[in-house]
């Protein structure tokens, strides 16, 4: 899976969309999880309604919401009041049994609010690396990760 970058402004809402084959994933609940480290587990943040037929109902966990258009095949995650600590690598997942298939890998970047003149030093952006393959740039707030970018800040 290539990684798609979604950029949002601190303090505002960010919508992440994850398209999928609606027939292939028919009947399956979805989830949004945060990757803990480059090879670590993906920690569940929020999942769609327990009854798949009600997946269109928005479910919240804190400031994160999820809703699923099961006919159109689009999972939408909303991160409300985006904060610097929300930056990082996430996954949209399709659940079956206790397993989860990755629908999309997402890198969330948090940009400084241009109207906020406070120190933006704690805002995080990806560093340099050569661990990711070529990927095309997508529209507006989202793009695929460029070659040479890494989704985790240096640990040293």
């Amino acid at each position: 899976h290539n990684t798609t970058v979604f950029q949002g402004v601190a303090g505002q809402s960010l919508q992440v969309s994850c398209p999928y084959d609606s027939m292939k994933h028919w009947g399956r609940r979805k989830a949004w999880c945060r990757q803990l480290g480059e090879k670590g587990p993906c920690q569940r943040v929020v999942s769609t309604h327990n009854l798949w037929l009600l997946s269109f109902l928005r479910r919240w966990n804190g400031s994160t919401a999820i809703t699923d258009d099961t006919l159109g095949g689009t999972l939408t995650i909303t991160l409300r009041n985006l904060q610097p600590h929300d930056a990082g690598l996430y996954q949209c997942q399709s659940l079956h049994g206790s397993e989860a298939d990755t629908l999309r890998k997402v890198l969330v970047e948090v940009l400084a609010d241009p109207l906020d003149h406070r120190d933006a030093g704690d805002l995080w952006f990806p560093g340099e690396s050569e661990s990711f393959e070529d990927a095309h740039v997508e529209h507006s707030i989202s793009r695929s990760l460029l070659e040479g970018e890494i989704p985790f800040p240096p640990t040293s």
């Epitope: 028919w26 009947g27 399956r28 798949w52």
Partner: antibody
Framework: EVQLVQSGAEVKKPGESLKISCKGS????????IAWVRQMPGKGLEWMGI????????RYSPSFAGQVTISADKSISTAYLQWSSLKASDTAMYFC????????????????WGQGTLVTVSS | DIQMTQSPSSVSASVGDRVTITCRAS??????LAWYQQKPGKAPKLLIY???SLQWGVPSRFSGSGSGTDFTLTISSLQPEDFATYFC?????????FGQGTKLEIK
């Protein structure tokens, strides 16, 4: 009426190749996953792997990975199971089965099965 | 892999009897379990899915229960056509695995 029709019985020699088929009808072939299950003579059922014909996404049991190849041709609603070099131990009945996800619990179960293809490998 | 263990491996019973077959998973599988019936020379047939949901067209004398690691299939009043082999199967994770089977024979 939903049907999975498998190809006929095969008698082969060790080292030969083989490809058996499973043709689905009465439903949209790109809406369901298709699994292959082995049953050796007088034994139980063994899940070999599964394929989604829409994009050929395939999962194998570790026990069968590298031993067989599962493929599909969505244009003719057919899934395949093939061997490049058969062994006597491959002698078994092979079933294909449609995997249906039940939205009650978001997991999948085998609701329709083919009649089975008996493969005999003997020198 | 998750191991599925059925007991007994065979059982003799008479028409009208109540029969219970058990299936134990080597780890918790929530309610992701199915039961199949297989007759000699035939393909398996789905009876129960999600541990307790009756597949369409299956007689109501068949019922399933359990969650986690322990599951049961019950036939409330055996009919002549019920003499067959029964398999449980976990739908929790790949690879899907089946129990070794329970052969139900006429006493």
């Amino acid at each position: 009426e939903v049907q999975l029709v498998q190809s006929g019985a095969e008698v082969k020699k060790p080292g030969e190749s083989l490809k058996i088929s499973c043709k689905g009808s009465g439903y949209s072939h790109t809406s369901y996953w298709i699994a292959w299950v082995r049953q050796m003579p007088g034994k139980g059922l063994e899940w070999m792997g599964i394929i989604y014909p829409g994009d050929s996404d395939t999962r194998y049991s570790p026990s069968f990975a590298g031993q067989v190849t599962i493929s599909a041709d969505k244009s003719i609603s057919t899934a395949y199971l093939q061997w490049s070099s058969l062994k006597a131990s491959d002698t078994a009945m092979y079933f294909c089965a449609r995997s249906r996800t039940f939205y009650y619990d978001s997991s999948d179960y085998f609701d329709y099965w083919g009649q089975g293809t008996l493969v005999t490998v003997s020198s | 892999d998750i191991q599925m263990t059925q007991s007994p491996s065979s059982v003799s019973a008479s028409v009208g009897d109540r029969v219970t077959i058990t299936c134990r998973a080597s780890q918790g599988i929530s309610s992701w379990l199915a039961w199949y019936q297989q007759k000699p020379g035939k393909a398996p047939k789905l009876l129960i899915y999600a541990a307790s949901s009756l597949q369409w067209g299956v007689p109501s004398r068949f019922s399933g229960s359990g969650s986690g690691t322990d599951f049961t299939l019950t036939i409330s009043s055996l009919q002549p056509e019920d003499f067959a082999t029964y398999f449980c199967q976990q739908a929790d994770s790949y690879p899907r695995t089946f129990g070794q089977g329970t052969k139900l024979e006429i006493k």
